[in-house]
């Protein structure tokens, strides 16, 4: 039977794969020379462990979990990655001033294990 993609974290609250908001400066990101910003930025990222069948994205992830338990040295555990993204607009520095550019894959919107 196909395993359920569980949302219960057996490691305790907040320890498993989920969306986090991380604050950073443009210097932290290495973007100071090409992005204009008056203050620190916020970025949403997927962080956390992927135990058992927690938020397994697909059958492949479920198989990976099972095989990791059997052969941890050969098969890595699933990774916590974005399932979808939110767009974000960057104000970019150009030779003639500044311009807007929308990036569709910059902010994680929700997360799963794969």
């Amino acid at each position: 039977a196909r395993a359920r993609n569980g949302d219960h974290c057996p490691l305790g609250p907040g320890r498993c794969c989920r969306l986090h908001t991380v604050r950073a400066s443009l210097e932290d990101l290495g973007w100071a020379d090409w992005v204009l910003s008056p203050r620190e930025v916020q970025v949403t990222m997927c962080i956390g462990a992927c135990p058992s069948q927690f938020r397994a994205a697909n059958m492949h992830a479920q198989i990976k979990t099972s095989l990791h338990r059997l052969k941890p040295d050969t098969v890595p555990a699933p990774c916590c990655v974005p399932a979808s993204y939110n767009p974000m607009v960057l104000i970019q520095k150009t030779r003639t001033g500044v311009s807007l550019q929308t990036y569709d894959d910059l902010l994680a919107k929700d997360c799963h294990c794969i």
Epitope: S37, P38, V41, Q42, P87, G97, L107
Partner: antibody
Framework: QVQLVQSGAEVKKPGSSVKVSCKAS????????VSWVRQAPGQGLEWMGG????????NYAQKFQGRVTITADESTSTAYMELSSLRSEDTAVYYC????????????????WGQGTLVTVSS | SYELTQPLSVSVALGQTARITCSGD??????VSWYQQKPGQAPVLVIY???NRPSGIPERFSGSNSGNTATLTISRAQAGDEADYYC??????????FGGGTKLTVLG
């Protein structure tokens, strides 16, 4: 089609508070930034602050810091603006406005607006 | 805090070109948006990032921005263009700033 529908007109006494709602439909609520902009009778536009549901935190214009609270309920795709210690100068039309998330700047480029809510402060 | 200055009113003859200015210190290095507001209605975004138009805004609307002045240009002005126009950018801490607004009157 994106729509922002605001709550109805309010009449308030000086010193009281008002809470205005803004319900979004036709788009992904958490993927955008929602601001509140007010316009006193015969006057210009004034940005009060805004919230990005995916970040969860609000930013406020210095003028309104401590007097305004902006919140969002993702489950109902609704943003709220509460203004306290009302005075007659707060009589205005209050608009919610939606825009993309702008890195660092966060708010602006308001491509969709609510219909406005008239708040009258009078004793 | 950053200030944007607009003329209170601008008049243009029907079919002619209207230019509405927005002055601010080194505004040429800012992103500037323009909004149109008709009486009793909510504002509408007409121009952003120099001269980009949202869908539904006619090509007659264009923008430019350099030095200390941003300009909204409305060519072949029509009676329906009569409205208040506001410029918008950000101050040094990222707060949204609007100009005081300009009332456009189309004559004839």
């Amino acid at each position: 089609q994106v729509q922002l529908v605001q709550s109805g007109a309010e009449v308030k006494k000086p010193g009281s508070s008002v809470k205005v709602s803004c319900k979004a439909s036709g788009g992904t609520f958490r993927s955008y930034a929602v601001s509140w902009v007010r316009q006193a009778p015969g006057q210009g536009l004034e940005w009060m602050g805004g919230i990005i549901p995916i970040f969860g935190t609000a930013n406020y214009a210095q003028k309104f810091q401590g007097r305004v609270t902006i919140t969002a309920d993702e489950s109902t795709s609704t943003a709220y603006m509460e203004l306290s210690s009302l005075r007659s100068e707060d009589t205005a039309v209050y608009y919610c406005a939606r825009g993309p998330i702008i890195m660092g700047y966060q708010f602006g480029l308001f491509d969709h607006w609510g219909q406005g809510t008239l708040v009258t402060v009078s004793s | 805090s950053y200030e944007l200055t607009q003329p209170l009113s601008v008049s243009v003859a029907l079919g002619q070109t209207a230019r509405i200015t927005c002055s601010g210190d080194n505004i040429g290095s800012h992103i500037v948006s323009w909004y149109q507001q008709k009486p009793g209605q909510a504002p509408v975004l007409v121009i952003y990032d120099k001269s980009n138009r949202p869908s539904g805004i006619p090509e007659r609307f264009s923008g430019s921005n350099s030095g200390n002045t941003a300009t909204l240009t409305i060519s072949r002005a029509q009676a329906g263009d009569e409205a208040d126009y506001y410029c918008q950018t950000w101050d040094s801490i990222g707060s949204v700033v609007f100009g005081g607004g300009t009332k456009l009157t189309v004559l004839g």
